[in-house]
């Protein structure tokens, strides 16, 4: 059964040009996270394996840097960055749990952090 | 010990499909991309695209990309490509080739399959 | 895309002799989160798939005599096979796996003189 709950940081929103950081945290269970995939809109961003380390998809190498933990950076933001971004982690024994994050990159300076939202 | 075992050589007519197989054993399969590379008669190597079965993500060579699909089936640690409206410059050796590209070890495409000769012809 | 352009097409080289091939690329390999260049070299011989000798540019893959040697960085890379032996008569191929599509050298052909 899976009882684990991921907390994502939510909506947020950033300007274009700089930069930010989607994290995913999973709690509320003892399973082994084996791996976290990152993706945007079904395209593979980065994948952290628990045994292999990082891979950054080369088609975001310059503007994408792991981390911190197994959250991703992104720079250089643009406003076709905005979209849906998705934490996929793989865990033993439970399987996959799936966080949600959406980013909008304004014109403006007046980028905003949303809240923090959780899914089961 | 880390082995790509391919199905056989096949012969085919133009404008039909081939599937080659690609079974993987010694490591484990969701791990490593595997890749598929071509070498026509007396030339040299070109990249189809890959695969990363840990997620099912697949990257293609825009010149093949409207004929060719690259699957996994993680159950049985076997690759699929699949090459349609087949023409008679697709003879070649289609090898598989297991990718290892994370950004701590990054050994490129370590281990190979022994090949699978296609063949196309009227 | 990126071109890998290999040169000499062709090189005869006598027993014991340095052999040297040069491997260009249309854009740099150079990552800088972790400072390696993307670039590998295969060999291979008649009749057999390749096989992988070097990665990052100068790291050889376990089992790889220590005569095969590669160096380089951003652009012009090189493999030099210090003192030819008859087992290393094949073709040499560069690849860069820096973006997609991964692209190879057109290959360079090793023989004895």
């Known amino acids: 059964m899976m009882t684990g709950t991921i907390e994502t940081t939510g909506n947020i929103s950033a300007e274009k040009g700089g930069s930010i950081i989607l994290q995913c945290h999973l709690s509320s269970t003892t399973a082994q996270v084996t791996q976290v995939n990152w993706e945007q809109q079904d395209q593979l961003l980065a994948i952290c394996n628990a045994d292999l380390g990082w891979h950054i998809s080369p088609s975001f190498k310059d503007r994408v840097a792991p981390g911190p933990g197994l959250g991703l950076t992104l720079q250089s933001l643009t406003v076709n960055d905005t979209g849906e971004y998705f934490c996929i982690y793989h865990t033993y024994p439970d399987g996959t749990y799936t966080g949600r994050i959406f980013l909008e990159v304004l014109e403006s300076s007046v980028a905003e952090h949303g809240a923090r939202f959780q899914i089961p | 010990e880390v082995q790509l075992v391919q199905s056989g050589a096949e012969v085919k007519k133009p404008g039909s499909s081939v599937k080659v197989s690609c079974k993987a054993s010694g490591y484990t399969f969701s791990n490593y991309w595997i890749g598929w590379v071509r070498q026509a008669p007396g030339q040299g190597l070109e990249w189809i695209g890959d695969?990363?079965?840990?997620?099912?993500?697949?990257n293609y060579n825009e010149k093949f990309k409207d004929r060719v699909t690259i699957t996994a089936d993680k159950s049985t640690s076997t690759a699929y490509m699949e090459l349609s409206s087949l023409r008679s410059e697709d003879t070649a050796v289609y090898y598989c080739?297991?990718?290892?590209?994370?950004?701590?070890?990054?050994?490129?495409?370590?281990?190979w399959g022994q090949g699978t000769l296609v063949t196309v012809s009227s | 895309d990126i071109v890998m352009t290999q040169s000499p097409d062709s090189l005869a080289v006598s027993l014991g002799e340095r052999a040297t091939i040069n491997c260009k690329s249309s854009q740099s390999l150079l990552y800088s989160r972790n400072q390696m260049n993307y670039l590998a070299w295969y060999q291979q011989k008649p009749g057999q798939s390749p096989k992988l000798l070097i990665y990052?540019?100068?790291t050889r893959e376990s089992g790889v005599p220590d005569r095969f040697s590669g160096s380089g960085s951003g652009t012009d890379f090189t493999l030099t096979i210090s003192s030819l032996q008859a087992e290393d008569v094949a073709v040499y191929y560069c690849q860069q796996y820096y973006s997609y599509p991964y692209t190879f050298g057109g290959g360079t052909k090793v023989e004895i003189k």
């Open positions: 695969i990363y079965p840990g997620g099912a993500y697949t």
């Open positions: 080739a297991r990718g290892d590209y994370y950004d701590s070890s990054g050994r490129a495409m370590d281990y």
């Open positions: 990052w540019t100068s």
